[in-house]
């Protein structure tokens, strides 16, 4: 909320850099054809670019990404019986970020 | 994406804890009259609870929060009058988190 002037530190810009975020491993990511299963873990940490740039016309974007395969457990329920499987999910980590110009949207003709 | 089993580390759950997130200040301070000439900084870092819990019926929630006033500089131009403001924005940091039971939504009667 916006208040009157109190003892407040000057706000520091959240610079454009990688930060740890939580990525939800959705069931659709594992198997689109079957709904009768559970995934463990339900979410993992990833590194993602975030923050602000010096200008409204530029955005914090990744300049270097790395794909990281991780193993998740898939528990299928078949005729009330749990079947344990392992699946690989490829996560995308951002390694480096940069404030890059946002291409102006093309006018609709 | 789901790949075949490669050399993949077991996925680790993103535990319920505080992580650094980016909070956009400019949205808070944008007035409907569009009088803002300049708001600085446009975004700041905050600490927020995120991550997953062991069960779908519990959610990662803050158990302790702290309000942190920060000073934002702002130039508004209203009817040719430049108004130089130092506004205080109160940010909410999460200090501690816990997996808490989600109260079941009451049925609509």
């Amino acid at each position: 909320s916006l208040g009157s002037l109190t003892v407040a530190e000057p706000a520091m810009i959240a610079e454009c850099k990688t930060r740890t975020e939580v990525f939800e491993i959705s069931r659709r990511l594992i198997d689109r054809t079957n709904a009768n299963f559970l995934v463990w873990p339900p979410c993992v940490e990833v590194q993602r670019c975030s923050g602000c740039c010096n200008n409204r016309n530029v955005q914090c974007r990744p300049t270097q990404v790395q794909l990281r395969p991780v193993q998740v457990r898939k528990i299928e329920i078949v005729r009330k019986k749990p079947i344990f499987k392992k699946a690989t999910v490829t996560l995308e980590d951002h390694l480096a970020c940069k404030c890059e110009t946002v291409a102006a949207a093309r006018p609709v003709t | 994406s789901l790949g075949s089993l490669t050399v993949a580390e077991p996925a680790m759950i993103a535990e319920c804890k505080t992580r650094t997130e980016v909070f956009e200040i400019s949205r808070r301070l944008i007035d409907r009259t569009n009088a803002n000439f300049l708001v600085w900084p446009p975004c700041v870092e905050v600490q927020r609870c995120s991550g997953c819990c062991n069960n779908r019926n519990v959610q990662c929630r803050p158990t302790q929060v702290q309000l942190r006033p920060v000073q934002v500089r702002k130039i508004e131009i209203v009817r040719k009058k430049p108004i130089f403001k130092k506004a205080t924005v109160t940010l909410e940091d999460h200090l501690a988190c816990k997996c808490e039971t989600v109260a079941a939504a009451r049925p609509v009667t």
Epitope: I13, R56 | P42, P82, F84
Partner: antibody
Framework: QVQLVQSGTEVKKPGASVKVSCKAS????????ISWVRQAPGQGLEWMGW????????NYAQKFQDRVTMTTDTSTNTAYMELRGLKSDDTAVYFC?????????WGQGTLVTVSS | DIQMTQSPSSLSASVGDRVTITCQAS??????LNWYQQKPGKAPKLLIS???TLETGVPSRFSGSGSGTDFTFTISSLQPEDIAKYYC?????????FGPGTKVDIK
Amino acid sequence: QVQLVQSGTEVKKPGASVKVSCKASGYTYGAYAISWVRQAPGQGLEWMGWISAYNGNTNYAQKFQDRVTMTTDTSTNTAYMELRGLKSDDTAVYFCARAWNSFDYWGQGTLVTVSS
Amino acid sequence: DIQMTQSPSSLSASVGDRVTITCQASQDIRKNLNWYQQKPGKAPKLLISDASTLETGVPSRFSGSGSGTDFTFTISSLQPEDIAKYYCQQYYNLPFTFGPGTKVDIK
């Protein structure tokens, strides 16, 4: 330290345009506006307008409204002032200055001479 | 536009003298006034902001006062390096406007 470095002297013919640059360093460019002020030979200071380095918002003095365009390039931390339809009485030193509620740092000035 | 007037337009004083320049606004500008020093061939330099706040690194012999429409700029003990032109500037309304300046030199 804060520095504003301007482009060099320009000689232009009446009716032409001039574009003066102002490269900023030593501070967070987007956190301030850049003002442009001119000074005719032996005369006082005249404010032309300003631009927000963060979002490109501009505000021009009425006198220059139709002839001036101020722009900013944050990839190089550079502000530009273009003046069109030059006349002999536009001969002046053009200054850029870091602006908030005062002009606390100034460029060295760019002399623009308009002569046929 | 707000008109700014300064007096005197020029003055000569001896080293060590107290020098006073006045600046008048054509309407109430509260304390929204700055003072600048400009030496020949150089860019202006901010000395005082908000009518009376001395900028960092500016010698304490410079001071400013006033509010509303009448403002004063004082050099308590004139030094040879103070030879320059001094301008007041309002930031209460757009366009920002400067006074015509006061030229200070040594007798």
